[in-house]
Interface confidence: medium
């Protein structure tokens, strides 16, 4: 006859938050401090993640779940489960291998992370530039020149200037 799993393996009865203690006749023992088991039937408890240095604790470790970290102010998460912290830059900048660098002319970044992106080309939509772009803000497109009432004028964008490229990344 087929024996049930619990008869085959007494450890399968140990719930999350405990481990099957071989040193104590496979009794279910609670996870020691700073450790956890998120599933039943485990023979060991896993060490809790420690949020140190640039990491800070978002969720404390419990006997059944690992701690969760995020990054201290001025940094943001990278990698699976916030495994790394990357520095924030200012608006109008992007992070390169050499640190934070200002956006090149004709590009902007309105966030503290992410990359500089080209200003919107208003003329592609048959519109005119209402407000010039900056390092921190995209241009604002207005009605097309044909839509403007007589005598109204639109702001013309300056001709794009070439700036020396940033070092990669």
């Amino acid at each position: 006859f087929e024996r049930t799993r619990s008869l085959q393996d007494p450890c399968s009865n140990c719930p999350a938050g405990t481990f099957c203690d071989n040193n104590r006749n496979q009794i279910c023992s609670p996870c020691p401090p700073n450790s956890f088991s998120s599933a039943g039937g485990q023979r060991t408890c896993d060490i809790c993640r420690q949020c140190k240095g640039v990491f800070r604790t978002r969720k404390e470790c419990s006997s059944t779940s690992n701690a969760e970290c995020d990054c201290t102010p001025g940094f943001h998460c990278l990698g699976a489960g916030c495994s790394m912290c990357e520095q924030d830059c200012k608006q109008g900048q992007e992070l390169t291998k050499k640190g934070c660098k200002d956006c090149c002319f004709g590009t902007f970044n309105d966030q503290k992370r992410g990359i500089c992106r080209p200003w919107t080309n208003c003329s592609l939509d048959g519109k005119s530039v209402l407000v010039n772009g900056t390092k921190e803000r995209d241009v604002v497109c207005g009605p097309s020149p044909a839509d403007l009432s007589p005598g109204a004028s639109s702001v013309t964008p300056p001709a794009p200037a070439r700036e020396p490229g940033h070092s990669p990344q």
Partner: antibody
Framework: EVQLLESGGGLVQPGGSLRLSCAAS????????MSWVRQAPGKGLEWVAN????????YYGDSATGRFTISRDNSKNTLYLQMNSLRAEDTAVYYC???????????WGQGTLVTVSS | QSVLTQPPSASGTPGQRVTISCSGS????????VYWYQQLPGTAPKLLIY???QRPSGVPDRFSGSKSGTSASLAISGLRSEDEADYYC???????????FGGGTKLTVL
């Protein structure tokens, strides 16, 4: 979950061409530099090339300059490596890697094997 | 010949501390961050150390990185059998405008 899946490897004769692809998912592809790194059988890692988020800047290792072209299609979340004038020494596993802005490779594909032999 | 120089092999017994060196120049290690990768047989490399001495979560604190001038090193304390792998250092090189790797160090746990 971030996934990088390379394809296009195989057996090719010396002087031949091959185009590798890397399908990316689980992240905003257009926000990141992407790279190709290769590893010849029993040898170390060798950086091949990388490409800026919008494709406007491309950088190549010595072995790739003049023969390989890196490109990307952000609308398809796909990275490419066009390899021409292939030589026996180009035989390697080619990995696609997502380059974090701090300049490191945290996510790698599983690799695709390119064999150049007659 | 790799731009970054590593010893081809290193070894130690369980519990020991092992250090792997990586030597470069002012164009790479001297002016850019150093990264360390671990590669187990038949698998893609795994990031161990970023920005000279930062450890991604999930990497045991037995692994530590340091940098001084144009050299860097990876230290592994409390060596375990599962640490047996190839280890690579890497850095951006400003003169080559590219990423450079060390030749790799094969670590054997005796």
């Amino acid at each position: 979950e971030v996934q990088l899946l390379e394809s296009g490897g195989g057996l090719v004769q010396p002087g031949g061409s091959l185009r590798l692809s890397c399908a990316a998912s689980g992240f905003t592809f257009s926000d990141y530099y992407m790279s190709w790194v290769r590893q010849a059988p029993g040898k170390g890692l060798e950086w091949v090339a990388n490409i800026k988020q919008d494709g406007s800047e491309k950088y190549y290792g010595d072995s790739a300059t003049g023969r390989f072209t890196i490109s990307r299609d952000n609308s398809k979340n796909t990275l490419y490596l066009q390899m021409n004038s292939l030589r026996a020494e180009d035989t390697a596993v080619y990995y696609c890697a997502k380059e974090e802005r701090i300049g490191t490779y945290y996510y790698w594909g599983q690799g695709t094997l390119v064999t150049v032999s007659s | 010949q790799s731009v970054l120089t590593q010893p081809p092999s290193a070894s130690g017994t369980p519990g020991q501390r092992v250090t792997i060196s990586c030597s470069g120049s002012s164009f790479n290690i001297g002016s850019n961050y150093v990264y360390w990768y671990q590669q187990l047989p038949g698998t893609a490399p795994k990031l161990l150390i970023y920005k000279n001495n930062q450890r991604p979560s999930g990497v045991p604190d037995r692994f530590s990185g340091s940098k001084s001038g144009t050299s860097a090193s990876l230290a592994i304390s409390g060596l375990r059998s599962e640490d047996e792998a190839d280890y690579y250092c890497a850095a951006w090189d400003d003169s080559l405008n590219g990423q450079v790797f060390g030749g790799g160090t094969k670590l054997t746990v005796l």
